[in-house]
């Protein structure tokens, strides 16, 4: 993908609401291309934050502050809702409502959209077409919460056109404006070092690389040209910078560390692959 | 700034059809709802319909009957039209464009519609 | 459909004069009510959306509260201009009402 983010692409905003107890409430609120967060919600001021010098995509002032307007009713809104029914639902303080909405994209083309709720960390309701259904599994609960929910047909609508226009709209405005930065190349790092032992006479090989992107990246233990099928990739994680950084380990015996190497690909290496090779490694970190 | 002309038909006979287009100038078409509201002489207003640029349509139950609203995105227009008026459907006709949240920041200067035998 | 109740149908002010007018909803709308000015022979003009947010270009001595079902219009100190027809309306489910409208007449 030329854009340096893997298909299908996502834009879609998370609201996460703690109620603590009946009057005390706390919500935070960001919006997300794909895993990179491009905006925030500040409760205070009750505004969008941009948090990338791109993040305001094609939209105009007007359309921006009309979403700030609408998101502040409808938080203002879902609380009081919630806190009303939170009896009548039986839910208990503390308790914690995600809501993740938004749509994907797929070969330039919009391929569906999205808005869920979950109770607790588990699935509770979600909107398909112009209504709010209950997950089988969650039971009278959900079922009720949807009865709430559509009261408002009007309200509905609108989430409809957000999800099915609005939002489909923006993402392409959005990785239109953020092309530039989206679709640039860096170099990952690369060193190696011991991990902690995993026991008597053995070693944990740790190939560290970092400050890559976009994210794709391929990184293997090797013996010669031999893949190391024992090689622990963890998570991808995330740097300040918009970079991201990998581990991979091997846990070898100590005698058979001496001819591996660690081989990184990366999209910004253009085929010319980094490898770092074990016995060249100074024994210090 | 955005700005909205209605054009059409000033007098009409009972059981005629009202037509009326209004005219979309500057601004964007796209993400709005586009809404034709009345007010008869001397009294309140009252909304007819609207409909969403991409062409899903909502009606006052009171005339959904009667009432058609259409949009033509190459044109930046959308339309109106009342069927089998009476003299209860004279009252001038305003074109207005809402955001979301259904207020409406954007008219027409209005045009009065006389229905009259 | 929600009714909107406005009162008073009509009053009398002298400029500088501070004015309040209050619209009520026969049922909770919110924070989705949205107030406009008409002068005759005019459209009307959005003063206040969302209970209280100003609208572009519309000066600060105009001002709105409330939420639920009581809603209040102030002009913290009334101008020549002002002397007008003031609606609210609410946008909280469809079809959007207005109130009959409050006639502001100079004293």
């Known amino acids: 993908n030329a854009d340096g983010l893997k298909e299908p692409l996502s834009f879609h905003v998370t609201w996460i609401a703690s109620f603590y107890n009946h009057s005390w409430k706390q919500n935070l609120v960001s919006g997300w291309l794909s895993d990179l967060q491009t905006h925030t919600w500040d409760s205070n001021s009750s505004t969008i934050v941009f948090l990338c010098p791109w993040s305001r995509g094609n939209f105009s002032n007007e359309e921006w502050k009309e979403l700030e307007t609408l998101f502040r009713i409808r938080t203002i809104r879902s609380f009081e809702g919630i806190r009303r029914y939170a009896h009548e639902l039986q839910f208990e303080y503390p308790f914690e409502i995600q809501v993740t909405g938004g749509c994907e994209l797929h070969s330039g083309k919009v391929s569906g959209s999205f808005l869920q709720l979950a109770y607790q960390g588990s699935d509770f309701v979600s909107f398909q077409n112009n209504s709010w259904l209950p997950y089988p599994v969650a039971g009278n609960m959900a079922k009720h919460f949807c009865k709430v929910l559509n009261q408002n047909q009007h309200e509905n609508d609108i989430t409809h056109n957000l999800l099915s226009d609005t939002c489909p709209r923006f993402i392409l405005g959005l990785l239109d404006a953020g092309k530039a930065h989206l679709q640039r190349q860096v170099k990952p790092e690369a060193w190696l070092s011991h991990g902690p032992s995993p026991g008597p006479g053995h070693l944990q090989l740790v190939c560290h690389v970092s400050g890559f992107y976009p994210k794709p990246v391929w990184v293997m233990w090797m013996r010669g040209e031999q893949e190391q099928q024992g090689t622990q990739r963890g998570d991808i994680l995330p740097s300040a910078d918009g970079t991201w950084y990998l581990r991979a380990t091997l846990e070898v015996a100590a005698g058979e560390a001496a001819d591996l190497s660690c081989r990184v690909k990366h999209s910004s290496l253009e085929g010319q692959d980094i490898v770092l090779y074990w016995e060249h490694h100074s024994s210090v970190g | 700034q955005v700005q909205l002309q209605e054009s059409g038909a000033g007098l009409l006979k009972p059981s005629e059809t009202l037509s009326l287009t209004c005219a979309v100038y500057g601004g964007s078409f796209s993400g709005y709802y586009w809404s034709w509201i009345r007010q008869p002489p001397g009294k309140g207003l009252e909304w007819i319909g609207y409909i969403y640029y991409s062409g899903s349509t909502n009606y006052n139950p009171s005339l959904k009957s009667r009432v058609t609203i259409s949009v033509d995105t190459s044109k930046n227009q959308f339309s109106l039209k009342l069927s089998s008026v009476t003299a209860a459907d004279t009252a001038v006709y305003y074109c207005?464009?809402?955001?979301?949240?259904?207020?409406?920041?954007?008219w027409g200067q209005g045009t009065l519609v006389t229905v009259s035998s | 459909d929600i009714q909107m109740t406005q009162s008073p149908s009509s009053l009398s002010a002298s400029v500088g004069d501070r004015v309040t007018i209050t619209c009520r909803a026969s049922?909770?709308?919110?924070?989705?009510l949205n107030w406009y000015q008409q002068k005759p022979g005019k459209a009307p003009k959005l003063l206040i959306y969302a209970a209280s947010s100003l609208q572009s270009g519309v000066p600060s001595r105009f001002s709105g509260s409330g939420s639920g079902t009581d809603f209040t219009l102030t002009i913290s100190s009334l101008q020549p201009e002002d002397f007008a027809t003031y609606y609210c309306?609410?946008?909280?489910?469809?079809?959007?009402?207005f109130g009959q409208g409050t006639k502001v007449e100079i004293k």
């Open positions: 309306q609410q946008s909280y489910s469809t079809p959007p009402t």
């Open positions: 207005a464009k809402a955001p979301y949240m259904m207020y409406f920041d954007s």
């Open positions: 049922q909770s709308i919110s924070s989705y």
